[in-house]
Protein backbone atom coordinates (compact mmCIF):
# COMPACT_ATOMS: atom_id res chain seq x y z
CA UNK A 1 0.00 0.00 0.00
CA UNK A 2 1.17 3.52 -0.77
CA UNK A 3 0.95 5.95 2.11
CA UNK A 4 -1.21 9.06 1.73
CA UNK A 5 -0.25 12.16 3.69
CA UNK A 6 -2.97 14.29 5.30
CA UNK A 7 -1.90 17.62 6.77
CA UNK A 8 -3.85 19.54 9.35
CA UNK A 9 -3.30 22.60 11.51
CA UNK A 10 -2.90 22.25 15.27
CA UNK A 11 -6.11 23.13 17.11
CA UNK A 12 -8.25 22.62 14.03
CA UNK A 13 -10.10 19.58 12.68
CA UNK A 14 -8.66 17.24 10.09
CA UNK A 15 -10.73 14.98 7.86
CA UNK A 16 -9.14 11.83 6.46
CA UNK A 17 -10.90 9.94 3.68
CA UNK A 18 -10.31 6.34 2.69
CA UNK A 19 -11.99 5.17 -0.51
CA UNK A 20 -12.71 1.44 -1.00
CA UNK A 21 -14.59 -1.01 -3.19
CA UNK A 22 -18.10 -0.99 -1.70
CA UNK A 23 -18.99 -4.39 -3.16
CA UNK A 24 -15.82 -6.13 -2.01
CA UNK A 25 -16.23 -4.79 1.53
CA UNK A 26 -20.04 -5.12 1.67
CA UNK A 27 -21.28 -5.89 5.19
CA UNK A 28 -17.93 -5.24 6.83
CA UNK A 29 -17.33 -2.87 9.70
CA UNK A 30 -14.39 -0.48 9.41
CA UNK A 31 -11.76 0.79 11.80
CA UNK A 32 -9.08 3.44 12.21
CA UNK A 33 -5.91 2.36 13.93
CA UNK A 34 -2.55 3.88 14.81
CA UNK A 35 0.65 2.17 13.74
CA UNK A 36 2.96 1.63 16.71
CA UNK A 37 6.44 1.77 15.25
CA UNK A 38 7.55 0.71 11.80
CA UNK A 39 6.79 -2.98 12.30
CA UNK A 40 4.62 -2.78 15.41
CA UNK A 41 0.91 -3.56 15.73
CA UNK A 42 -1.83 -1.20 14.62
CA UNK A 43 -3.67 -0.05 17.75
CA UNK A 44 -7.42 0.45 17.28
CA UNK A 45 -8.54 4.04 17.84
CA UNK A 46 -12.18 3.82 16.79
CA UNK A 47 -14.41 1.51 14.75
CA UNK A 48 -17.77 1.99 13.10
CA UNK A 49 -20.93 1.08 15.02
CA UNK A 50 -21.59 -2.60 15.59
CA UNK A 51 -24.67 -2.46 13.37
CA UNK A 52 -23.29 -2.27 9.84
CA UNK A 53 -26.55 -0.80 8.53
CA UNK A 54 -25.97 2.16 10.86
CA UNK A 55 -22.36 2.74 9.78
CA UNK A 56 -23.40 6.21 8.62
CA UNK A 57 -23.66 7.24 12.27
CA UNK A 58 -20.53 9.04 13.37
CA UNK A 59 -18.94 7.03 16.16
CA UNK A 60 -16.75 8.96 18.54
CA UNK A 61 -13.84 7.94 20.73
CA UNK A 62 -12.54 11.02 22.46
CA UNK A 63 -11.68 13.56 19.76
CA UNK A 64 -11.70 11.03 16.90
CA UNK A 65 -14.81 10.12 14.89
CA UNK A 66 -15.45 7.59 12.15
CA UNK A 67 -18.30 7.36 9.66
CA UNK A 68 -18.79 5.07 6.68
CA UNK A 69 -20.59 5.72 3.42
CA UNK A 70 -21.14 2.05 2.64
CA UNK A 71 -22.85 2.72 -0.70
CA UNK A 72 -20.33 5.23 -1.99
CA UNK A 73 -17.40 3.33 -0.53
CA UNK A 74 -15.77 6.09 1.50
CA UNK A 75 -14.64 5.85 5.09
CA UNK A 76 -14.18 9.25 6.76
CA UNK A 77 -12.24 9.91 9.94
CA UNK A 78 -12.40 13.23 11.76
CA UNK A 79 -9.60 14.23 14.13
CA UNK A 80 -10.95 17.11 16.18
CA UNK A 81 -8.73 19.69 17.91
CA UNK A 82 -5.64 18.26 16.23
CA UNK A 83 -2.55 18.15 18.46
CA UNK A 84 1.14 17.56 17.68
CA UNK A 85 0.97 14.14 19.36
CA UNK A 86 -1.66 13.10 16.78
CA UNK A 87 1.00 13.08 14.08
CA UNK A 88 1.99 9.63 12.91
CA UNK A 89 1.13 6.66 10.74
CA UNK A 90 -2.40 5.26 10.74
CA UNK A 91 -4.47 2.74 8.80
CA UNK A 92 -8.04 2.57 7.59
CA UNK A 93 -9.16 -1.03 7.96
CA UNK A 94 -11.98 -3.29 6.82
CA UNK A 95 -12.87 -5.89 9.45
CA UNK A 96 -13.95 -9.47 8.88
CA UNK A 97 -13.97 -11.81 11.84
CA UNK A 98 -10.71 -11.33 13.71
CA UNK A 99 -8.93 -10.26 10.53
CA UNK A 100 -8.45 -6.76 9.13
CA UNK A 101 -7.69 -5.65 5.57
CA UNK A 102 -5.82 -2.39 5.09
CA UNK A 103 -7.83 0.06 2.98
CA UNK A 104 -5.29 2.87 3.12
CA UNK A 105 -2.12 3.78 4.99
CA UNK A 106 -2.25 7.37 6.19
CA UNK A 107 0.46 9.66 7.50
CA UNK A 108 -1.00 12.49 9.58
CA UNK A 109 1.15 15.61 9.73
CA UNK A 110 0.34 18.41 12.14
CA UNK A 111 1.29 21.92 11.08
CA UNK A 112 1.88 24.68 13.61
CA UNK A 113 -1.05 26.98 14.27
CA UNK A 114 -0.22 30.32 12.62
CA UNK A 115 -1.73 32.06 15.66
CA UNK A 116 0.83 30.47 17.97
CA UNK A 117 3.23 33.43 17.71
CA UNK A 118 0.66 35.75 19.29
CA UNK A 119 0.54 36.61 22.97
CA UNK A 120 -1.68 34.31 24.96
CA UNK A 121 -3.93 37.25 25.69
CA UNK A 122 -4.81 37.57 22.02
CA UNK A 123 -5.80 33.95 21.66
CA UNK A 124 -9.41 32.80 21.74
CA UNK A 125 -10.21 29.54 23.49
CA UNK A 126 -13.59 27.88 23.14
CA UNK A 127 -15.48 27.00 26.31
CA UNK A 128 -15.17 23.27 25.76
CA UNK A 129 -13.17 21.04 23.47
CA UNK A 130 -16.24 19.96 21.51
CA UNK A 131 -16.94 23.49 20.36
CA UNK A 132 -13.72 23.58 18.34
CA UNK A 133 -15.76 22.21 15.48
CA UNK A 134 -17.88 25.34 15.50
CA UNK A 135 -14.81 27.56 15.53
CA UNK A 136 -12.73 25.93 12.81
CA UNK A 137 -13.59 24.65 9.39
CA UNK A 138 -12.65 21.01 8.88
CA UNK A 139 -10.09 20.66 6.12
CA UNK A 140 -7.23 18.53 4.97
CA UNK A 141 -4.39 18.64 2.51
CA UNK A 142 -3.38 15.22 1.23
CA UNK A 143 -0.70 13.76 -1.00
CA UNK A 144 0.90 10.37 -1.57
CA UNK A 145 4.36 9.69 -0.23
CA UNK A 146 6.96 9.76 -2.96
CA UNK A 147 8.85 6.56 -3.65
CA UNK A 148 11.70 6.28 -1.23
CA UNK A 149 10.09 8.53 1.40
CA UNK A 150 9.71 6.87 4.77
CA UNK A 151 6.90 7.69 7.18
CA UNK A 152 8.98 6.92 10.26
CA UNK A 153 12.35 8.50 11.11
CA UNK A 154 15.21 6.00 10.76
CA UNK A 155 15.98 4.18 13.99
CA UNK A 156 19.52 4.51 15.31
Amino acid sequence: HNTTVFQGVAGQSLQVSCPYDSMKHWGRRKAWCRQLGEKGPCQRVVSTHNLWLLSFLRRWNGSTAITDDTLGGTLTITLRNLQPHDAGLYQCQSLHGSEADTLRKVLVEVLADPLDHRDAGDLWFPGESESFEDAHVEHSISRSLLEGEIPFPPTS
Epitope: L54, F56, L57, R58, R59, W60, T67, E130, S131
Partner: antibody, heavy 117, light 107 residues
Protein backbone atom coordinates in the same frame (compact mmCIF):
# COMPACT_ATOMS: atom_id res chain seq x y z
CA UNK B 1 -22.71 18.37 30.29
CA UNK B 2 -24.84 16.62 27.68
CA UNK B 3 -28.50 17.56 27.99
CA UNK B 4 -31.47 16.41 25.90
CA UNK B 5 -34.92 17.86 26.59
CA UNK B 6 -37.99 16.49 24.80
CA UNK B 7 -41.21 18.46 24.35
CA UNK B 8 -44.41 18.42 22.31
CA UNK B 9 -46.15 15.47 23.92
CA UNK B 10 -49.80 15.50 24.90
CA UNK B 11 -53.19 13.90 24.31
CA UNK B 12 -54.22 13.46 20.68
CA UNK B 13 -57.04 11.64 18.93
CA UNK B 14 -56.40 8.60 16.72
CA UNK B 15 -55.60 9.57 13.14
CA UNK B 16 -54.29 13.00 14.14
CA UNK B 17 -50.72 14.33 14.07
CA UNK B 18 -48.18 15.54 16.60
CA UNK B 19 -44.62 16.86 16.37
CA UNK B 20 -42.09 16.16 19.09
CA UNK B 21 -38.94 18.20 19.61
CA UNK B 22 -35.69 17.42 21.38
CA UNK B 23 -33.48 20.36 22.34
CA UNK B 24 -29.81 19.43 22.68
CA UNK B 25 -27.08 21.23 24.59
CA UNK B 26 -23.66 20.58 26.09
CA UNK B 27 -22.20 19.01 22.96
CA UNK B 28 -21.74 19.73 19.25
CA UNK B 29 -25.15 18.55 18.08
CA UNK B 30 -24.22 18.63 14.38
CA UNK B 31 -21.55 15.99 14.96
CA UNK B 32 -23.81 13.25 16.30
CA UNK B 33 -26.45 10.88 15.02
CA UNK B 34 -29.70 10.90 17.01
CA UNK B 35 -32.48 8.43 17.80
CA UNK B 36 -36.04 8.36 19.01
CA UNK B 37 -36.93 5.50 21.38
CA UNK B 38 -40.33 4.97 23.00
CA UNK B 39 -41.71 3.18 26.02
CA UNK B 40 -45.38 2.20 26.25
CA UNK B 41 -46.89 2.42 29.77
CA UNK B 42 -45.60 -0.47 31.87
CA UNK B 43 -43.70 -1.92 28.90
CA UNK B 44 -40.10 -2.10 27.67
CA UNK B 45 -38.17 0.19 25.35
CA UNK B 46 -38.71 0.20 21.58
CA UNK B 47 -36.39 1.84 19.06
CA UNK B 48 -38.34 4.12 16.70
CA UNK B 49 -36.02 5.97 14.31
CA UNK B 50 -32.48 7.21 13.72
CA UNK B 51 -30.96 10.09 11.74
CA UNK B 52 -27.35 10.78 10.78
CA UNK B 53 -25.42 13.81 12.01
CA UNK B 54 -26.12 15.71 8.79
CA UNK B 55 -29.67 14.44 8.22
CA UNK B 56 -28.79 12.57 5.03
CA UNK B 57 -29.55 9.08 6.35
CA UNK B 58 -32.69 7.95 8.20
CA UNK B 59 -34.07 4.59 9.27
CA UNK B 60 -37.36 3.63 10.93
CA UNK B 61 -38.88 0.76 12.84
CA UNK B 62 -41.43 -1.18 10.76
CA UNK B 63 -44.17 -0.20 13.23
CA UNK B 64 -43.86 3.51 12.34
CA UNK B 65 -42.54 3.43 8.76
CA UNK B 66 -44.60 5.65 6.46
CA UNK B 67 -46.27 7.45 9.39
CA UNK B 68 -43.38 8.98 11.33
CA UNK B 69 -40.64 11.27 10.02
CA UNK B 70 -37.41 12.03 11.87
CA UNK B 71 -35.61 15.29 11.05
CA UNK B 72 -33.17 17.74 12.56
CA UNK B 73 -32.21 21.40 12.42
CA UNK B 74 -28.53 21.66 13.29
CA UNK B 75 -28.69 25.46 13.36
CA UNK B 76 -31.20 25.17 16.22
CA UNK B 77 -29.62 22.13 17.90
CA UNK B 78 -33.00 20.41 17.67
CA UNK B 79 -34.23 16.95 16.71
CA UNK B 80 -37.83 16.37 15.59
CA UNK B 81 -40.28 13.51 15.22
CA UNK B 82 -43.32 14.23 13.06
CA UNK B 83 -45.98 11.66 13.92
CA UNK B 84 -48.94 11.28 11.54
CA UNK B 85 -51.91 8.88 11.50
CA UNK B 86 -51.45 8.20 15.19
CA UNK B 87 -52.80 4.99 16.69
CA UNK B 88 -53.64 3.91 20.23
CA UNK B 89 -50.57 1.67 20.20
CA UNK B 90 -48.35 4.74 19.69
CA UNK B 91 -49.16 5.82 23.25
CA UNK B 92 -45.81 5.95 25.02
CA UNK B 93 -43.11 8.08 26.56
CA UNK B 94 -40.84 9.19 23.71
CA UNK B 95 -37.14 9.64 24.40
CA UNK B 96 -34.47 11.15 22.20
CA UNK B 97 -31.02 9.62 22.53
CA UNK B 98 -27.59 10.47 21.19
CA UNK B 99 -25.46 8.09 19.15
CA UNK B 100 -21.89 8.80 20.19
CA UNK B 101 -19.34 6.25 21.30
CA UNK B 102 -22.22 3.82 21.64
CA UNK B 103 -25.51 3.43 19.84
CA UNK B 104 -27.45 5.13 22.67
CA UNK B 105 -25.03 6.93 24.96
CA UNK B 106 -27.14 9.78 26.39
CA UNK B 107 -30.91 10.00 26.78
CA UNK B 108 -33.46 12.70 27.50
CA UNK B 109 -36.12 12.52 30.22
CA UNK B 110 -38.91 11.78 27.76
CA UNK B 111 -42.27 13.29 26.77
CA UNK B 112 -45.58 11.44 27.07
CA UNK B 113 -47.80 10.97 24.03
CA UNK B 114 -51.32 9.67 24.67
CA UNK B 115 -53.44 8.64 21.70
CA UNK B 116 -57.05 8.38 22.81
CA UNK B 117 -60.51 9.30 21.61
CA UNK C 1 -35.81 -9.16 14.63
CA UNK C 2 -33.87 -10.43 17.63
CA UNK C 3 -35.97 -10.92 20.77
CA UNK C 4 -34.29 -10.35 24.14
CA UNK C 5 -35.85 -12.08 27.16
CA UNK C 6 -34.88 -10.82 30.60
CA UNK C 7 -35.29 -12.76 33.81
CA UNK C 8 -36.44 -12.56 36.44
CA UNK C 9 -39.06 -9.85 35.84
CA UNK C 10 -38.61 -8.70 39.44
CA UNK C 11 -35.74 -9.26 41.86
CA UNK C 12 -36.35 -8.51 45.55
CA UNK C 13 -33.11 -8.00 47.43
CA UNK C 14 -31.65 -6.07 50.35
CA UNK C 15 -28.84 -3.49 50.23
CA UNK C 16 -25.48 -5.21 50.33
CA UNK C 17 -26.73 -8.32 48.55
CA UNK C 18 -25.53 -9.54 45.17
CA UNK C 19 -27.87 -9.11 42.19
CA UNK C 20 -27.69 -11.36 39.12
CA UNK C 21 -29.79 -10.37 36.11
CA UNK C 22 -30.12 -12.48 32.98
CA UNK C 23 -30.70 -11.58 29.33
CA UNK C 24 -31.22 -14.25 26.66
CA UNK C 25 -31.23 -13.53 22.92
CA UNK C 26 -33.34 -15.43 20.38
CA UNK C 27 -30.19 -15.78 18.23
CA UNK C 28 -26.52 -15.01 18.66
CA UNK C 29 -25.63 -11.34 19.12
CA UNK C 30 -21.92 -12.07 19.54
CA UNK C 31 -20.78 -9.65 22.28
CA UNK C 32 -22.87 -6.74 21.00
CA UNK C 33 -25.02 -6.33 24.08
CA UNK C 34 -25.50 -3.31 26.34
CA UNK C 35 -27.17 -2.81 29.73
CA UNK C 36 -29.07 0.29 30.87
CA UNK C 37 -30.39 1.41 34.23
CA UNK C 38 -33.61 3.39 34.53
CA UNK C 39 -35.03 4.97 37.66
CA UNK C 40 -38.67 6.17 37.87
CA UNK C 41 -39.15 9.41 35.93
CA UNK C 42 -35.55 9.44 34.77
CA UNK C 43 -33.75 8.81 31.51
CA UNK C 44 -32.10 5.42 30.94
CA UNK C 45 -28.36 5.40 31.65
CA UNK C 46 -25.79 3.29 29.84
CA UNK C 47 -23.99 0.93 32.24
CA UNK C 48 -22.29 -1.75 30.15
CA UNK C 49 -21.47 -2.00 26.44
CA UNK C 50 -20.12 -4.83 24.32
CA UNK C 51 -21.26 -7.30 27.01
CA UNK C 52 -18.56 -6.57 29.58
CA UNK C 53 -17.19 -3.02 29.27
CA UNK C 54 -18.24 -0.49 31.88
CA UNK C 55 -19.35 2.88 30.52
CA UNK C 56 -17.62 6.05 31.74
CA UNK C 57 -18.35 6.83 35.38
CA UNK C 58 -20.02 3.50 36.17
CA UNK C 59 -18.94 2.00 39.53
CA UNK C 60 -16.91 -1.22 39.59
CA UNK C 61 -19.70 -3.08 41.42
CA UNK C 62 -21.47 -3.34 38.03
CA UNK C 63 -20.11 -6.04 35.75
CA UNK C 64 -21.33 -7.76 32.62
CA UNK C 65 -20.52 -11.13 31.13
CA UNK C 66 -21.61 -13.53 28.42
CA UNK C 67 -21.54 -13.89 24.66
CA UNK C 68 -23.67 -15.42 21.96
CA UNK C 69 -27.15 -15.77 23.42
CA UNK C 70 -26.72 -15.68 27.21
CA UNK C 71 -25.69 -12.61 29.15
CA UNK C 72 -25.52 -11.60 32.80
CA UNK C 73 -25.41 -8.27 34.61
CA UNK C 74 -24.05 -8.58 38.13
CA UNK C 75 -24.21 -5.97 40.88
CA UNK C 76 -21.75 -7.27 43.47
CA UNK C 77 -23.16 -5.40 46.46
CA UNK C 78 -26.37 -3.44 46.08
CA UNK C 79 -26.33 0.21 47.08
CA UNK C 80 -29.60 2.06 47.84
CA UNK C 81 -29.31 3.96 44.53
CA UNK C 82 -29.12 0.71 42.53
CA UNK C 83 -32.79 -0.15 42.99
CA UNK C 84 -34.18 0.49 39.52
CA UNK C 85 -35.21 -1.21 36.28
CA UNK C 86 -32.46 -2.71 34.12
CA UNK C 87 -32.72 -3.27 30.34
CA UNK C 88 -30.49 -5.18 27.97
CA UNK C 89 -30.15 -4.07 24.34
CA UNK C 90 -28.54 -5.67 21.31
CA UNK C 91 -26.91 -3.92 18.38
CA UNK C 92 -25.82 -7.00 16.49
CA UNK C 93 -28.73 -7.07 14.08
CA UNK C 94 -31.06 -4.41 12.69
CA UNK C 95 -33.29 -3.15 14.19
CA UNK C 96 -31.71 -2.63 17.62
CA UNK C 97 -33.94 -4.23 20.23
CA UNK C 98 -34.37 -4.11 24.00
CA UNK C 99 -35.33 -6.66 26.61
CA UNK C 100 -38.49 -6.28 28.68
CA UNK C 101 -36.57 -5.22 31.77
CA UNK C 102 -35.83 -6.53 35.24
CA UNK C 103 -36.98 -4.53 38.24
CA UNK C 104 -34.62 -4.67 41.21
CA UNK C 105 -36.66 -3.73 44.27
CA UNK C 106 -35.93 -3.43 47.97
CA UNK C 107 -36.91 -6.55 49.93
Amino acid sequence: QVQLVESGGGVVQPGRSLRLSCAASGFTFSSYGMHWVRQAPGKGLEWVAVISYDGSNKYYADSVKGRFTISRDNSKNTLYLQMNSLRAEDTAVYYCARAGGHLFDYWGQGTLVTVSS
Amino acid sequence: EIVLTQSPATLSLSPGERATLSCRASQSVSSYLAWYQQKPGQAPRLLIYDASNRATGIPARFSGSGSGTDFTLTISSLEPEDFAVYYCQQDSSFPPTFGGGTKVEIK
